[in-house]
């Protein structure tokens, strides 16, 4: 895949170079969620903004139905970042009836689907335990990696507890991926 | 934007093709902070480490007066941790007075400056209470996303309270912006 | 290192453009941790999967006894995730014998070893004050930045603590890189 | 270029209070801490305490707990430190400082004497 | 709280000469430490931050080094005005405290 002084009495064959520029590529920002239908025994998936404000798709990156389509196969970069927020968190309570509960906890989870796979993978995660001795609490997770796609993957931002997610800014709560 | 089989038969136009190593790209380290004016209504911008240590800028991205200036436009990574450190914390005392109080929180936020736009954009923000029980505390906040950039645009970095920024060491807070 | 409209009457010798796909890219996955020896001042380095799963070596970029070895200068994207789990913290005692207590913390380190150079360089550090009322506590520390590399050059992730790092799923605690 | 001018020298009876003022200029007054020092004649610096001018949250160290009050007024640039209950020991240069992080101070006022004595 | 000791309290030397001041923490402060040069009636001035750092428009013979507990100043080449009162300070946690101050007198 390279194009070498290309003058008419080379034997190559060069394959096609792409611009940058008409790689896949999408970032969506934080909407207010609203109540739906989750898959039994999984986080909830966040739905998304994909064109107003920061947010865009490009180049056959498509966002529907929570999820972004890759258009294409290769090696992308993928991140995303939910901002929770709290109002009490019973980590003080924690030693009640002689014993240590469960702490609180957050949760973020981004999975690829895969059709002719029977079971979501999950690609990335980050979980923190929430013991907060304040009233109310807030904190990002951030969370980002390469990982070989395939064309007709299906991405998607799953968390532990979508009443939690701060909806209120665009920059606060987002997902992205583009192909490198 | 392709280059195939280049040869003198064929019909098409070809658009440059850029090599990657000549994109504008940057990565900047902490400094000590020394007071400066801020904008009115607007967190304060740390001032950054341009060429020393593992500082660099590249390729027409420059770095002036706190901004990194973007010089041409298209699609940008952009990142930055800050790592925050303290001796106190009042969240302890949160329920002075039978009412919680507001608690401590640190917050960085990547802002685009448009000459054209009389506001500033916020494209990242990352926020936390910080509710520590001990008496000195540190964290890091790290942020990164990908934005369509045009040139002329400025970025910085804003935080909510300047005198809490670790500048001890340049892998500790830092900032960075590649075209993609 | 450009090509354009490659008629034969040019007189441009055109730098090889090569393709994206063939940039040297890594993206390891944690493994469970065995005792080892570690440098002498210096937090002891994870080991890591690298081909089953989500793990992938390409394009000459190889992982070795710890290390990702770099096989091409140039600027790369180079990120971690260690997420770390612990049963307790004393911080909650931080006030014992009247005195506060250093608190326990986290810390995660990117590091650069040049066999030219005596001294390796630390690239990205994560580190954060542990300080949980709670008797369980997770969380995950993530890095990520650009830096410029060598040939030559091997990269690693130390942890401050070995025995605190989640190494039960892929997708907590990982270790990548790719040439931009 | 960053100032930090105090308030003239006080000369007070014990029991008595005392408010030394602070007016900083050349810099965003609400952006960083101001810090209280003080040194009594011929001794070394004994650090007070400090005030955040963006919220007007304090932290004192505890043997001034109870009689010290750090406030400022953020629309003249200007932080204060009042003690009570004025002692013979308390005579000292009282100053301000500020810097650019939590750990050092860059500016320093020029200081204010206060003297106790009946 | 954290205690800091400077040695010597007092050091008698030439100008050109050089002086090494030493400062000991009670605990361990990383390197939280700063100094500052103090002249009669004077405010004090900031010299090293962050243990070893230089602070802007200071002369290069002052150094600093150290973490943990044990750090040092070392003025390298003394000049007249050198002469003064040095104190460290901690900030590592609060409350931040200075050590008793070296007085640097002229031989």
């Known amino acids: 895949l390279k194009g070498q002084e290309f003058a008419p009495s080379h034997q190559q064959v060069y394959a096609p170079l792409r611009a940058d520029g008409d790689k896949p590529r999408a970032h969506l920002t934080v909407v207010r969620q609203t109540p739906t239908q989750h898959f039994k025994n999984q986080f909830p998936a966040l739905h998304w903004e994909h064109e107003l404000g920061l947010a865009f798709t490009k180049n056959r990156m498509n966002y529907t139905n929570k999820f972004l389509l890759i258009p294409e196969s290769g090696d992308y970069f993928i991140y995303s970042q939910v901002t929770f927020r709290g109002m009490t968190s019973e980590c003080s309570e924690i030693r009640q009836a002689g014993r240590p509960n469960k702490p609180d906890s957050i949760t973020v989870v981004i999975t690829k689907v895969t059709d002719s796979y029977p079971e979501p993978t999950q690609l990335l995660m980050g979980t923190k335990s929430v013991c907060e001795v304040g009233s109310n609490w807030f904190q990002p997770i951030y969370l980002g990696a390469m990982f070989s796609l395939q064309e007709g993957d299906k991405l998607m931002v799953n968390v532990s507890d979508i009443s939690l997610v701060d909806y209120t800014k665009e920059d606060k709560t987002f997902f992205g991926a583009f192909l490198l | 934007l392709k280059g195939q089989e280049f040869a003198p038969s064929h019909q098409q136009v070809y658009a440059p093709l850029r090599a990657d190593g000549d994109k504008p790209r940057a990565h900047l380290t902490v400094v000590r902070q020394t007071p400066t004016q801020h904008f009115k209504n607007q967190f304060p911008a740390l001032h950054w480490e341009h060429e020393l240590g593992l500082a660099f800028t590249k390729n027409r991205m420059n770095y002036t007066n706190k901004f990194l200036l973007i010089p041409e436009s298209g699609d940008y990574f952009i990142y930055s941790q800050v790592t925050f450190r303290g001796m106190t914390s009042e969240c302890s005392e949160i329920r002075q007075a039978g009412r919680p109080n507001k608690p401590d929180s640190i917050t960085v936020v990547i802002t685009k400056v448009t000459d054209s736009y009389p506001e500033p954009t916020q494209l990242l923000m990352g926020t936390k209470s910080v509710c520590e029980v001990g008496s000195n505390w540190f964290q890091p906040i790290y942020l990164g996303a990908m934005f369509s950039l045009q040139e002329g645009d400025k970025l910085m970095v804003n935080v909510s309270d300047i005198s809490l920024v670790d500048y001890t060491k340049e892998d500790k807070t830092f900032f960075g912006a590649f075209l993609l | 290192l450009k090509g354009q409209e490659f008629a034969p009457s040019h007189q441009q010798v055109y730098a090889p453009l090569r393709a994206d796909g063939d940039k040297p890219r890594a993206h390891l996955t944690v493994v469970r941790q065995t005792p080892t020896q570690h440098f002498k001042n210096q937090f002891p380095a994870l080991h890591w999967e690298h081909e089953l799963g989500l793990a992938f070596t390409k394009n000459r970029m190889n992982y070795t006894n710890k290390f990702l070895l770099i096989p091409e200068s140039g600027d790369y994207f180079i990120y971690s995730q260690v997420t770390f789990r612990g049963m307790t913290s004393e911080c909650s005692e931080i006030r014992q014998a009247g005195r506060p207590n250093k608190p326990d913390s986290i810390t995660v380190v990117i590091t650069k070893v040049t066999d030219s150079y005596p001294e390796p360089t630390q690239l990205l550090m994560g580190t954060k004050s542990v300080c949980e009322v709670g008797s369980n506590w997770f969380q995950p520390i993530y890095l990520g930045a650009m830096f410029s590399l060598q040939e030559g050059d091997k990269l690693m992730v130390n942890v401050s603590d070995i025995s605190l790092v989640d190494y039960t799923k892929e997708d907590k605690t990982f270790f990548g890189a790719f040439l931009l | 270029q960053v100032q930090l001018v105090e308030s003239g020298a006080e000369v007070k009876k014990p029991g008595a209070s005392v408010k030394v003022s602070c007016k900083a200029s050349?810099?965003?007054?609400?952006?960083?801490?101001m810090h209280w020092v003080r040194q009594a004649p011929g001794q070394g610096l004994e650090w007070m305490g400090w005030?955040?001018?963006?919220?007007?949250?304090?932290n004192y160290v505890q043997k001034f707990q109870g009689r010290v009050t750090m406030t400022r007024d953020t629309s003249i640039n200007t932080a204060y430190m009042e003690l009570n209950n004025l002692k013979s020991d308390d005579t000292a240069v009282y100053y301000c400082?500020?810097?650019?992080?939590?750990?050092?101070?860059?500016?320093w006022g020029q200081g204010t004497m206060v003297t106790v004595s009946s | 709280d954290i205690q800091l000791t400077q040695s010597p309290s007092s050091v008698s030397a030439s100008v050109g000469g050089r002086v090494t001041i030493t400062c000991r923490a009670s605990?361990?402060?990383?390197?939280?430490l700063a100094w500052y040069q103090q002249k009669p009636g004077k405010a004090p001035n900031l010299l090293i931050y962050?243990?070893?750092s230089l602070q802007s428009g200071v002369p290069s013979r002052f150094s600093g080094s150290g973490s943990g507990t044990d750090f040092t100043l070392t003025i390298s080449s003394l000049q007249p005005e050198d002469f003064a009162t040095y104190y460290c300070?901690?900030?590592?946690?609060?409350?931040?405290?200075f050590g008793g101050g070296t007085k640097l007198e002229i031989k």
């Open positions: 005030i955040k001018p963006k919220s007007g949250g304090t």
């Open positions: 605990q361990d402060i990383s390197i939280w």
């Open positions: 962050a243990a070893s």
């Open positions: 300070q901690q900030a590592d946690s609060f409350p931040l405290t």
């Open positions: 400082a500020t810097g650019g992080s939590q750990d050092a101070s860059d500016f």
């Open positions: 050349g810099y965003t007054f609400t952006g960083y801490y």
